[in-house]
């Protein structure tokens, strides 16, 4: 039975040209995290594998930095980066947990972080 929950940074906004940390946290389970995939729709951004470390997609290799932790730092933001991001936790023995973050990249200097929220 899957008992865990994913906590994410929720809806967030950031300035064009700036950077943002995409962060998820898996709680309420003793399952072992074997891999975390970061995706935008069906496109891979990066993978953090427990044994092999980080792999950054070619499309993002020049502006994605691994971490902090299992999170991802997205740099040199453009308005095209606006959209949904998913953290996909591969765990044993539970299976897969998915968290969602919505990022809005703003032209102006007004960019506020949304509240944290949980996805069961």
């Amino acid at each position: 039975m899957m008992t865990g929950t994913i906590e994410t940074t929720g809806n967030i906004s950031a300035e064009k040209g700036g950077s943002i940390i995409l962060q998820c946290h898996l709680s309420s389970t003793t399952a072992q995290v074997t891999q975390v995939n970061w995706e935008q729709q069906d496109q891979l951004l990066a993978i953090c594998n427990a044994d092999l470390g980080w792999h950054i997609s070619p499309s993002f290799k020049d502006r994605v930095a691994p971490g902090p932790g299992l999170g991802l730092t997205l740099q040199s933001l453009t308005v095209n980066d606006t959209g949904e991001y998913f953290c996909i936790y591969h765990t044993y023995p539970d299976g897969t947990y998915t968290g969602r973050i919505f990022l809005e990249v703003l032209e102006s200097s007004v960019a506020e972080h949304g509240a944290r929220f949980q996805i069961p």
Partner: antibody, heavy 120, light 107 residues
Framework: QVQLEQSGGEVMKPGASVKISCKAT????????IEWVKQRPGHGPEWIGE????????YYNEKFRGKATFTADKSSNTAYMQLSSLTSEDSAVYYC?????????????WGQGTTLTVSS | DIQMTQTTSSLSASLGDRVTISCSAS??????LNWYQQKPDGTVTLLIY???SLHSGVPSRFSGSGSGTDYSLTISNLEPEDIATYYC?????????FGGGTKLEIK
């Protein structure tokens, strides 16, 4: 030594499905992506997509989404590509290749190729 | 998608010649370019990665260079076993794309 041994050529009817295999030997299967590449006669290769065998994470060239499906069997160190709803456009040589996990963006060993002929 | 163009589809040269094969990208690819050799029997081998890094086991007569959108593969002293088709491939972003190939023949 590193080897990627592909299944033999296939002759299939339009509308059918085919599954091509790629058996890896001489290295740690889970430490490398398996890449799939299509080559029609007289044309340059086309990248279909990739699978990370350890987790089964698969990513596709948008052009081949819905056409190709990747799987991998860690116990036999074998990757598979299924092609569905075959048409004459799918007649080609299909290659598997490996790409090291991490920030290594080249295909350093290739299979010998599998020739697929789709004909009524 | 980024288009890779190899304008010379076939090339004839003599043994011992210095041969240069060119490849251009539809936009800048920041040296994110690989070269592969495909023998007449279909066997594919990686020659060069990241524009100019020689893959292990590849003879030193092969070299690569370029920047921006224009790249080249040079064979300094053509040998009989170099008869093959050569493909460039970028990895600036997904999807990876390949050039149409340059077939090298002996005069």
């Amino acid at each position: 030594q590193v080897q990627l041994e592909q299944s033999g050529g296939e002759v299939m009817k339009p509308g059918a499905s085919v599954k091509i295999s790629c058996k890896a030997t001489g290295y740690t299967f889970s430490n490398y992506w398996i890449e799939w590449v299509k080559q029609r006669p007289g044309h340059g290769p086309e990248w279909i997509g990739e699978i990370l065998p350890g987790s089964g994470s698969a990513y596709y060239n948008e052009k081949f989404r819905g056409k190709a499906t990747f799987t991998a069997d860690k116990s036999s160190n074998t990757a598979y590509m299924q092609l569905s709803s075959l048409t004459s456009e799918d007649s080609a040589v299909y290659y598997c290749a490996r790409q090291k996990y991490g920030n290594y963006y080249y295909f350093d060993y290739w299979g010998q190729g599998t020739t697929l002929t789709v004909s009524s | 998608d980024i288009q890779m163009t190899q304008t010379t589809s076939s090339l004839s040269a003599s043994l011992g010649d210095r041969v240069t094969i060119s490849c251009s990208a539809s936009q800048g690819i920041s040296n994110y370019l690989n070269w592969y050799q495909q023998k007449p029997d279909g066997t594919v081998t990686l020659l060069i990665y990241y524009t100019s890094s020689l893959h292990s086991g590849v003879p030193s007569r092969f070299s690569g260079s370029g920047s921006g959108t224009d790249y080249s593969l040079t064979i300094s002293n053509l040998e009989p076993e170099d008869i093959a088709t050569y493909y460039c491939q970028h990895y600036s972003k997904l999807p990876y794309t390949f050039g149409g190939g340059t077939k090298l023949e002996i005069k």
